[in-house]
Structures are given as C-alpha cells and as structure tokens.
C-alpha cells in the first residue's frame, strides 16, 4: 500500500465511555490534525475508513457495521455505538484517503463499568463553584448530538448516590443544576442521567462531574505577606546559617498565577555571587486559598551578607506586594568579667 501520513496514537484523546450507553466519537483528524473539515474532504472525493485493534491484540481489523440493530454505525465523521459493550475497548483508527492522499490517526477507547452509585474508573471533570456567592450552575456535559432538539429527554440529577430532590440549596433545572448558594458541604460528585427514546428503544447517558467549592472573588484580597514582618529580626554572627521564611497567603482566584520570589539588594538570588538556596512549599485551604512559603537559606553568612537587603515579593491577579526582612549582625556581648576585674584592680 502507498505511504500514509500516520499521526500515531493520539493519547491526548483518552476517550472513556460507559458500558451499555450510546457513544459518539468524532474522528480526531478533523479536530486536531488537518486544516479542513469532513464536508470539504468528502466533497473532494476523500473517503473516511474506520478500523480497530482489540485490547491486548496487535491485529488491526475492520469494524463490523453489520451488527444487529446497527449497534455500531458511522455517520459522516462520527463513529456511533448504540450502545457500547465492554469488549469494544481498544485502539480505533480513522483513515482519510483517496488514490493520491492518505492520512490516519489512532486513539484509545475505553469502555468503563459503573456501579449503582455511578462510581467508576472514569476520569471526572472538575467544576469550581464560589463559596456563598449566589446562583451558579453546572451543566450536564457532553450530551450534544445524541438526540435531535425535537426530542425532550428526562434528566435526573444525583449527588453521590442520592437523587437531588428538594435539596436545600440545589435545584435541578433540566440539563442545569442550579446552586442557590454553595458551601463546602456541596463538594462531591454530581451525576446527570439523561434518558431519551430513539427508534422504539430507550437510551441512557450518564455524566458525572466533581464539584469543588472555592473561595469567592468577593472575598479575594491582594497577597498577604505574613513573614517576614516587623516583629522578627534575623540577627546572626558571620559563619552562622541564615534562614528567612517568606510566607504568603493568596486568596483563591480562578486562573490566577500566584508568584513568590526573593530579591537580594534588588537582584534575583541567581544574579548575586553568594551561595543561596531557596526551598518552596505550598499548602491549600479547603476553599483552595493558597499559602506559599519560600525559605531563603545562606549556609555560612558573611558580615557582607548581613548588610544586604532581603525582600520577599508576591504577586497574584489581585496585586503585588513586597516586604523586607530585618537582618542584622549580632553585636558581641560586652565582656563584663574583664571590665569588673579592672574595676576591682583600681581600688
């Protein structure tokens, strides 16, 4: 066979679908690899061919499109399962070709089992809700294209194992689940089950997502530097180890980049000819507020180092702050014994 542009196995598209449910999978060629869409390709006389490799096998084989009730079918650039079976798991390839052109890509499809409480090995998307913020919604994901707009599905929402019905602050509204007010207690997995009829059969789509309640933007503040502060003086003798922690609190802010850094005499530590190490640790509160600690360490401090300016800086989408550490050279204690001896000698 002639050469084919092989994009390999697209592991970025690790597709997971539930057993015994419909699944529609678009050929990734048109979404990620080629600059034209299926309609253009089709008009140009290109044909889309599907085949697969079963789990734990090496042999590529054609997909059987002649199963009872058209269980597997192809429509334009979409491969349909109505419904999936566990042994549909494998690597699927879509190939676009004519006599002069060929391009193909493979992707893994995993058919996953779920229990009666919707627990499964499925990787769940995370939706963040602001704490005590007012109405926010989550939407039943990835159900477009399964049924025409003329079909009115029934949608049932669950939190964990429990149907959401007259929940205190959560209202099911079709494809949406409205949170009148969100609390930490609303953290968890939410499942929508969409039931729709098709050709005399009833199909179910199960979609689960994780809700994480995070700090509200109305409570967000610029970074707060807890350390260094005015109450602590770092007093060292030359030769001792100097350790200065910079501890900064960041309010949760969606898509904000939180940064902490030290400057020594106005320069980055890497640009100063001294042996400095900086270790960072990060902790999060239940609402994903963040505390970052960067410890600046100089193993054997010199008297020159003790005269330098050490400033901790922090930045988030809410603003930038800085705080200098008070560093001093320890003054040797007066040698009282000698002075007293001199005193006695004078009498």
């Amino acid at each position: 066979s002639e050469r084919c542009d092989d994009w390999g196995l697209d592991t970025m598209r690790q597709i997971q679908v539930f057993e015994d449910e419909p699944a529609r999978i678009k050929c990734p060629l048109f979404e990620h690899f080629l600059k034209f869409n299926y309609s253009t390709a089709h008009s140009a006389g290109l044909t889309l061919i599907w085949y697969w490799t079963r789990q734990d096998r090496d042999l590529e084989e054609p997909i059987n499109f002649r199963l009872p009730e058209n269980r597997i079918s192809k429509e334009k650039d979409v491969l349909w399962f109505r419904p999936t079976l566990l042994n549909d798991t494998g690597n699927y390839t879509c190939m676009l070709r004519n006599t002069t052109y060929c391009s193909k890509v493979a992707f893994p499809l995993e058919v996953v089992q779920k229990d009666s409480c919707f627990n499964s090995p499925m990787k769940l998307p995370v939706h963040k809700l602001y704490i005590e913020y007012g109405i926010q919604r989550i939407t039943c994901p990835n159900v477009d294209g399964y049924f025409p707009s003329s079909v009115k599905p029934t949608i049932t929402w669950y939190m964990g194992c429990y149907k959401i019905q007259n929940f205190n602050n959560v209202i099911p509204e079709g494809m949406n689940l409205s949170f009148l007010i969100a609390f930490i207690s609303n953290n968890g997995n939410y499942t929508c089950v969409v039931t729709y009829p098709e050709n005399g059969r009833t199909f179910h789509l199960t979609r689960t997502l994780t809700v994480k309640v995070v700090g509200s933007p109305k409570n967000a503040v610029p970074p707060v530097i807890h350390s260094p502060n005015d109450h602590v003086v770092y007093e060292k003798e030359p030769g001792e180890e100097l350790l200065i922690p910079c501890t900064v609190y960041f309010s949760f802010l969606m898509d904000s980049r939180n940064e902490v850094w030290w400057t020594i005499d106005g320069k980055k530590p890497d640009d100063i000819p001294i042996d400095v190490t900086i270790n960072e640790s990060i902790s999060h509160s239940r609402t994903e507020d963040e505390t970052r600690t960067q410890i600046l360490s100089i193993k054997k401090v010199t008297s020159e180092d003790l005269k330098r300016s050490y400033v901790c800086h922090a930045r988030s989408a809410k603003g930038e702050v800085a705080k200098a550490a008070t560093v001093k050279q320890k003054v040797p204690a007066p040698r009282y014994t000698v002075e007293l001896a001199c005193g006695f000698g004078a009498t």
Partner: antibody
C-alpha cells in the same frame, strides 16, 4: 413550630417604615434552611417577597417587584429573621407571613402572620 | 419574571368526588413546583413539593403531577375538610432565584 409573625405590625403612614421579625423554633440551629416572606393583601392571593438563607446572611433573593424597598436580614444565634419595609404605600397593606423550609420555596413552617395597614 | 396561572376558580364537587386544579408556568420550571392549601384566617400549608412528592402528614388523596410548564393537583375522595383555596408555587432560577404563586383556586365541597 414557628412562633407568630413577630412584630405586632399595625398602622403605618404612607412613606413610613416598619420592621417585622419572626423566630423559627421548628429547626435546630445547626440546620440550614430558607427563611422566606410572603404577603397576602385582604381578599387576594399569596405573593412571594423574598428568601434569605439562614446559614448565610450574604445570600438573599427578592421578587422583582420589591425593587430595593424591602430588606431581609437574619440573626443566626437567635434564629430570628427580619423583614424591613420602607417607602410603604397603601398597596403594601397586607398580612405578612414568614415561612421556612429546608428547600427553597418549599415552606413547611409558617408564622401566623402580621397585618400591616398603610393609611394616612 | 415567572408568572403562574391557575385554573379554574372556583371549582366545586360533591363529597367523595374528584377535583383537578391546573397550574401553568410562563417558563419551563421542570419539576420545581409546590402546592399549598389555605383555609380562611390561617397561614398556608404545604401539600406537595417537587411537583409530585407528598409533604409529611398529607393524606394520599392529594396527588400532584406534571413537569415543564403544565402541572395538576388532584384531590380524590373529596372530604368536606378539603374546602379551601389552593395555590401553586413555581421556583425558577434563570436570572435570579424567583418564586411565584398562582392566583389561587377556591374548592367548594357540596
């Protein structure tokens, strides 16, 4: 259950203000619930005013027609909710009920109501 | 804003009979509807929530059905004690959280 409509209500002049309060005794203090207010003009139907979440004074919802004239508040320690009525007109003459429920809008505990008459 | 329309009013039936009250929502409110009963001089009493779930202590002769924009309250085996005004309450959160009562339906027991 729920103690009466709270404030004694009574006669208020047009343009005047009044605060109605009621105390819920059918919920434990640890329970989160909605405290809502509903009014009923003489011989008319029920009209929803608004709701406040008893666990958080920050979250309140009002009917569109309220237009900032009424304010809901709550004192979580005393399990008391209040409705501040401002810029009152004769059209605000009604029986004002406080109602509570674990579900938003599903009020299973009601106060006996407070009659507010706005007249010069 | 959400508008709830109730029909008919008044409605009358004999003891032991069946009464059906309809409630129509101006928006799709899914199953977010409650029914209340109010007798003269008393506060309302919750009968049904989530369109069809019976509230605690409510006799099974009361039933609710419907979803979306059309809802029904049915009282079968009517008793003289059921003479009251019945209100539907819709819950809608499209822009802000909004509750709206229907205009009420008076039930007369003959």
């Amino acid at each position: 259950e729920q103690s009466g409509g709270g404030a004694e209500g009574g006669l208020v002049k047009p343009g005047g203000s009044l605060e109605l309060c009621c105390k819920a005794s059918g919920f434990s203090l640890s329970t989160s619930y909605w405290r809502c207010w509903v009014r009923q003009a003489p011989g008319k139907g029920l009209e929803w005013i608004g709701c406040i979440y008893a666990g958080s004074g920050d979250v309140t919802y009002y009917a569109n027609w309220v237009n900032g004239r009424f304010t809901l508040s709550r004192d979580i320690d005393q399990s008391t909710g209040c409705l501040q009525l401002n810029s009152l007109t004769a059209a605000d003459t009604a029986m004002y009920y406080c109602a509570s429920g674990v579900g938003f809008g599903y009020f299973n505990l009601w106060g006996q109501g407070t009659l507010v008459t706005v007249s010069s | 804003a959400l508008v709830m329309t109730q029909t008919p009013s008044p409605v009358s039936a004999a003891v032991g009979g069946t009464v059906t009250i309809n409630c129509q929502a101006s928006e799709d409110i899914y199953s977010n509807l409650a029914w209340f009963q109010q007798k003269p001089g008393q506060p309302p009493k919750l009968l049904i929530y989530d369109a069809s779930t019976l509230a605690s202590g409510v006799p099974s002769r009361f039933s609710g059905s419907g979803s979306g924009t059309e809802f029904t309250l049915t009282i079968s085996g009517l008793q003289s004690d059921d003479a009251a005004t019945y209100y539907c309450l819709g819950v809608y959160t499209h822009i802000s959280a909004d509750n709206a009562f229907g205009g009420g339906t008076e039930v007369v027991v003959k």
